[in-house]
């Protein structure tokens, strides 16, 4: 299962950590995809490492752990964020976070 804070808030110009937690007795995480609505933010592969989408490379920092640190937030960053955990064996698990960026 995926456990996450469903709603988080942060100040404009500040930063926020996007974090999902996956727990399973049998499946191992092999990849985690992070998306802002339908737009790819970053991917973490246990074997291949991190890929951060070029459009976000100046504002998205991998970590901590399998999460992301989203920096220099703007009001336009308000919205839904999704983590997708790919596991082996087991399948796909999704989590949702709503980020509200507030005026500073």
């Amino acid at each position: 299962t995926i456990d996450t804070k469903r709603n988080i808030s942060a100040e404009e110009g500040g930063s926020v950590i996007l974090q999902c937690h996956f727990s399973s007795d049998t499946a191992e995480v092999t990849q985690v995809d992070w998306k802002q609505q339908d737009q790819l933010l970053a991917i973490y592969s246990v074997d291949l490492g991190w890929h951060v989408a070029s459009v976000f490379s100046d504002r998205v920092v991998p970590g901590p752990s399998l999460g992301l640190t989203f920096q220099s937030l703007t009001m336009n960053d308000t919205g839904e964020y999704f983590c997708t955990y790919h596991t082996y064996p087991g399948g796909i698990y999704k989590g949702r976070i709503f980020l509200k960026v507030q005026e500073s």
Epitope: V46, L48, G49
Partner: antibody
Framework: QVQLQESGPGLVKPSETLSLTCTVS??????????LAWIRQPPGKGLEWIGS???????YYNPSLESRVTISVDTSKNQFSLKLSSVTAADTAVYYC?????????????????WGQGTMVTVSS | EIVMTQSPATLSVSPGERATLSCRAS??????LAWYQQKPGQAPRLLIY???TRATGIPARFSGSGSGTEFTLTISSLQSEDFAVYYC?????????FGGGTKVEIK
Amino acid sequence: QVQLQESGPGLVKPSETLSLTCTVSGGSISSGSYYLAWIRQPPGKGLEWIGSIFRSGSTYYNPSLESRVTISVDTSKNQFSLKLSSVTAADTAVYYCAIEGANFKDFGYVAFDIWGQGTMVTVSS
Amino acid sequence: EIVMTQSPATLSVSPGERATLSCRASQSVSSNLAWYQQKPGQAPRLLIYGASTRATGIPARFSGSGSGTEFTLTISSLQSEDFAVYYCQQSPPWPRTFGGGTKVEIK
């Protein structure tokens, strides 16, 4: 540019073990950030993924073949290999080695970017 | 595992015409889909990754679209060298799975 070449016997007897090797040239497995994969194609049929291995030794297998498959890597020889035990006529196929995820860091996708030419293996007594 | 289904099995098209190939996943794969072209006696070649991005050296007449469970490969104007078998494939998750293929033949 990385290139792949499969090698091994073209004929294997039923119940024996099929053994194939893929030699990687133009790049070092030990420093490469990609998966090394085996895929097969029975005559006149489609593609079937057999399994993949990362340089660290992490392996992932097709569940339908898992009990019979072993994939290993020899970084010193820049090779990886496939062993498929207890073969039957249904294992007759062209066997391809491939590299998967070579462009992950740059482009964020995992696909079979580079393929060997393939080697035909017939299972028959 | 995710089952990939391609249709049609065979597509008869005249040179210069448009070809539209379909691929359906049994569950959502987001945009984690690749297309390959295979000619007789040759290894497959990567055409499209990420559902819509052309691989290096692939002509602009090849385009991919779709996300989730429904995907399409379009060849805008078929050339003689395009008559081949086309496969879709999802990745990730494990296990990697291919569709059964669509053969594009000369009408």
